[in-house]
């Protein structure tokens, strides 16, 4: 008898007739930038403080009738979803509301900027515990709004935003496109993407995860005890803001990078029917539905990793695409993908003192994506070892030669346009797992890391006959850090990580002869970090 | 630049004409860029966020805003500074004619200018 959305985000161990997970986010303050709200609604009375901040445009239309309950509708519902007594996610969280949307639900980029500045100034004047900022709004792509979000995130604030309700690529909207913001798409009770009239939830690489966003019961501003069902990516974002408040209340020292990784880690995986998304967006859209962690503590010192896709490079011959990790994350591997199969591989390179993953388009190619594997690896010391193209027919190889360094990822990059079209595959010699192997025409890049308690192993899955997709997964307790194809023959479209599985995609089988050339091997590098206690002993 | 410390609200008419040239040369030869919303119905022309370079101080932001007003006034344009940003991004929000964008982009410390646009509840 509890609302479906609360049941969906609750791990089975908490489920009963009631929704009462431990600690309701009481150490966290959630800022809501939205419409005005009805603060005396019984769901939120005493837990939402209405600030004096208001920056809204005038309503459109000369005959617009301002009705208080309609003006408050959107914000009241979202405040209820985040922290409502009876139908809220983080029942203990306190909230502060800023009015940046008018009675028609419309605001401006400038008003939102001034609101974000107000939050930053409040934070400086009176530092409190962890802050979560919920932005249940969207406009067109805005460099300045994204920049402001970046600055606020770097000041330690967690920003959560709606992906947008335009059934479109979320990267075309702000603040959804800001990398530092946690961007949330909406799913329904059947774990399907939400359709809203002729439109629906946004999707794509700028979405971090999905959350319940259809028929969400929450506080209605129609009366102080009323409830109403609303739908949208705002409702989905409110769920994630609530979950974030719960996590931060349990572990107040979590950084944004740690929080994002945990949100991804504890999400339900592969439950969304991807057929709803446009075909070209399916691989880019995370198949994740947010959930609370099974226990507020005990995530411990697991190795958390996520996959970050770059923007598309575009089709020009020398076009490149770059994928970046967040400031607190380590780039442990780099791969690339092209729908046409025409690419010149990828490499890890330093940019502004940090490693990035760069993929290279090839002549006649429609463009490439770079795919970074970004991980939380405290006290890590990582470097890239490169072997230039080899003269020998054995192929190019590179390994981690520094004491205590382990291989976390392999990349290969070549200058020639049609690498390996008529060449047999190069196989890794047995008994040498700590090295990357590739074609003699390619330069090979090994990501080598040293971190307390870090151990890695290589896992391969080869299929002799051609197949459109070959996968290899890391077993329980191990985390996928590297994903690549062996060999880099021309019919391989690329490799990428989906959760803990390495996926190698090849061209349509019908266009490839079933010769030995069709053989594809997916290579996963699986790592784990032994318990922090052991790690600290190693350091001594 | 000597005119940077002037009180432009009081000295609009007294400014020497040659100072115009000083103000219009951007620093370090970098060109500030202009951005606007790709979705036409969401654009709000007439209001602009002028974003200044990262290390710009509040006093410089205020001076740059006053300088824009002064130069606009000499060209017969009214402008209104709606807000001066500091704390997150240095810059200011200005209500002005789009005709002044070229002028504004040449002001010192300017990184980029973005036309205001609408956001919507989702």
């Amino acid at each position: 008898s509890i609302p479906w959305n609360l049941e969906r985000i609750t791990p089975p161990r908490y489920r009963a007739d009631e929704y009462q997970p431990p600690d309701g986010g009481s150490l966290v303050e959630v800022y809501l930038l939205d419409t005005s709200i009805q603060s005396d609604h019984r769901e939120i009375e005493g837990r939402v403080m209405v600030t004096d901040f208001e920056n809204v445009p005038e309503e459109d239309g000369t005959r617009f009738h301002r009705q208080a309950s309609k003006c408050d509708s959107h914000g009241t519902h979202l405040a209820g979803v985040v922290s409502g007594r009876d139908a809220g996610v983080a029942k203990g969280a306190s909230m502060r509301s800023l009015r940046v949307l008018n009675c028609q639900g419309k605001g401006t980029v400038s008003g939102t900027l001034i609101g974000l500045e107000f939050i930053r100034k409040s934070q400086l004047v009176q530092p409190v515990g962890p802050l979560v900022v919920l932005l249940p709004l969207a406009g067109g792509y805005s460099r300045v709004l994204n920049a402001a979000c970046q600055r606020l995130a770097r000041a330690g604030v967690v920003l959560v935003t709606a992906a947008g309700n335009f059934r479109d690529d979320a990267c075309l909207y702000s603040p959804a496109s800001a990398p530092e913001v946690i961007t949330v798409g909406a799913t329904n009770a059947q774990d399907q993407p939400v359709t809203l009239g002729t439109l629906g939830t946004n999707f794509g690489r700028c979405v971090d995860l999905f959350a319940p966003g259809e028929d969400i019961i929450g506080a209605s501003s129609d009366c102080s005890t009323c409830f109403v069902s609303q739908s949208g990516t705002s409702q989905a974002a409110a769920h994630v803001a609530g979950i974030a408040a719960m996590m931060l209340s349990a572990e107040p020292e979590l950084t944004l990078a740690e929080l994002r990784q945990r949100l991804i880690h504890f999400s339900a995986k592969d439950v969304i029917n991807e057929a709803w998304f446009p075909e070209d967006q399916r691989v880019l859209t995370p198949n994740l539905v947010a959930a609370l962690p099974p226990s507020t503590h005990g995530a411990g010192w697991q190795l958390f990793c996520r996959t970050v896709w770059s923007a598309h490079s575009g089709p020009t011959r020398m076009a490149t695409a770059v994928a970046r990790c967040a400031p607190d994350e380590e780039l442990l591997s780099c791969s690339s993908f092209s729908r046409s199969g025409k690419r010149r591989g990828e490499r890890m390179e330093a940019q502004g003192g940090k490693l990035v993953c760069r993929a290279h388009n090839a002549f006649g190619g429609e463009g490439v994506y770079a795919i970074a594997r970004c991980c939380l690896l405290p006290q890590a010391n990582c470097s890239v070892h490169t072997a230039p193209p080899a003269e020998a027919s054995m192929g190019t190889r590179v390994h981690c030669h520094q004491q205590g360094h382990v291989l976390t990822g392999c990349s290969s990059h070549w200058e020639v346009e049609d690498l390996g079209t008529h060449k047999p595959p190069v196989l890794r010699p047995r008994g040498q797992p700590n090295q990357c192997v590739g074609h003699r025409e390619a330069s090979i890049h090994a990501s080598c890391c040293h971190a307390p308690g870090l151990e890695c192993k290589v896992k391969e899955h080869g299929i002799p006959a051609p197949q459109e997709q070959v996968t290899v997964a890391c077993e329980e307790g191990w985390t996928l850090t590297g994903c690549s194809a062996l060999p880099g023959t021309s019919h391989v479209l690329g490799a990428y990580a989906v959760d803990n599985t390495c996926v190698v995609r090849s061209r349509d089988v019908s266009t490839t002869g079933s010769t030995s050339e069709g053989a594809v091997t997916a290579v996963a590098i699986c790592c784990r970090s032994r318990h922090l206690a052991q790690a600290s002993q190693e350091l001594q | 630049q000597e005119d940077e410390d002037g009180d432009y609200e009081e000295l609009v008419l007294a400014l020497r004409s040659e100072e115009d040239g000083l103000a219009e040369a951007p620093e370090h030869g970098t060109t500030a860029t202009f951005h606007r919303c790709a979705k036409d119905p969401w654009r709000l022309p007439g209001t602009y966020v002028v974003v200044l370079k990262e290390e710009t101080h509040l006093s410089q932001s205020e001076r740059t805003a006053r300088r824009l007003q002064a130069q606009a006034a000499r060209r017969g344009y009214l402008t209104k500074i709606l807000h001066v940003f500091h704390g997150l991004l240095p810059g200011f929000l200005v209500k002005m004619s789009g005709d002044l964008l070229e002028l504004a982009l040449k002001l010192p410390h300017v990184d980029y200018i973005e036309e205001d646009s609408s956001v919507f509840a989702q």
């Epitope: 008898s1 509890i2 009876d86 139908a87 019961i217 009366c223 102080s224 005890t225 009323c226 | -």
Partner: antibody
Framework: QLQLQESGPGLVKPSETLSLTCTVS??????????WGWIRQPPGKGLEWIGS???????YYNPSLKSRVTISVDTSKNQFSLKLSSVTAADTAVYYC??????????????????WGQGTLVTVSS | EIVLTQSPATLSLSPGERATLSCRAS??????LAWYQQKPGQAPRLLIY???NRATGIPARFSGSGSGTDFTLTISSLEPEDFAVYYC????????FGGGTKVEIK
């Protein structure tokens, strides 16, 4: 069929605390579908809502009585109780307990007081 | 606080007659208004909710209308058991009750 029954002392001295309990039968106070409320009626006068409570512990009270009221739900005994402190003669009334749909589960029915207990008269006198 | 004013205070009618009771709110309560019936020595009973919906088991002779600030309870043909006190209640902003209208036998 759901029934509610109020119980508690019929006489309370001024400045003391009035304590009443409502026992629920034919239903559960642990349901997320309902709030459990108290309403009072001074002799010959109209009705006044005192406050309501939810199984999870959330409560809300009439602002005019808020400083003196505590309502709690005891799921183990399937009952809920009212405590009203610092009573005066003006608190003499028939006290009713009633169920109210929380609105969280829309199918549970209208968001009003229904059913009610039969009421218990509490007199405040020394 | 929203104040509900009921009129008349007393309504003297005979069985079979039509009874019209009024409830006026000090500010709009939209349609968030209910009517209760209370007989001597008994608890109130919900008759009409959300201005015009009959509660379970309530005879069709009872009907409610109105929205905003003005509401009416109509008993189309009074039965002997209908003589009682009737209260309106709003939930637009917390809960308040009207002072009541007593329907007595003429």
């Amino acid at each position: 069929q759901l029934q509610l029954q109020e119980s508690g002392p019929g006489l309370v001295k001024p400045s003391e605390t009035l304590s009443l309990t409502c026992t629920v039968s034919g239903g559960s106070v642990s349901s997320s579908s309902y709030y459990w409320g108290w309403i009072r009626q001074p002799p010959g006068k109209g009705l006044e809502w005192i406050g309501s409570a939810y199984y999870s512990g959330s409560t809300y009270y009439n602002p005019s009585l808020k400083s003196r009221v505590t309502i709690s739900v005891d799921t183990s005994k399937n009952q809920f109780s009212l405590k009203l402190s610092s009573v005066t003669a003006a608190d003499t009334a028939v006290y009713y307990c009633a169920r109210e749909n929380s609105g969280v589960v829309p199918a549970a029915g209208p968001n009003w007081f229904d059913p009610w207990g039969q009421g218990t008269l509490v007199t405040v006198s020394s | 606080e929203i104040v509900l004013t009921q009129s008349p205070a007393t309504l003297s009618l005979s069985p079979g007659e039509r009874a019209t009771l009024s409830c006026r709110a000090s500010q709009s309560v939209s349609s968030y208004l209910a009517w209760y019936q209370q007989k001597p020595g008994q608890a109130p009973r919900l008759l009409i909710y959300d201005a015009s919906n009959r509660a379970t088991g309530i005879p069709a002779r009872f009907s409610g209308s109105g929205s905003g600030t003005d509401f009416t309870l109509t008993i189309s043909s009074l039965e002997p058991e209908d003589f009682a006190v009737y209260y309106c209640q709003q939930r637009r902003n917390w809960f308040t009750f009207g002072g009541g209208t007593k329907v007595e036998i003429k």
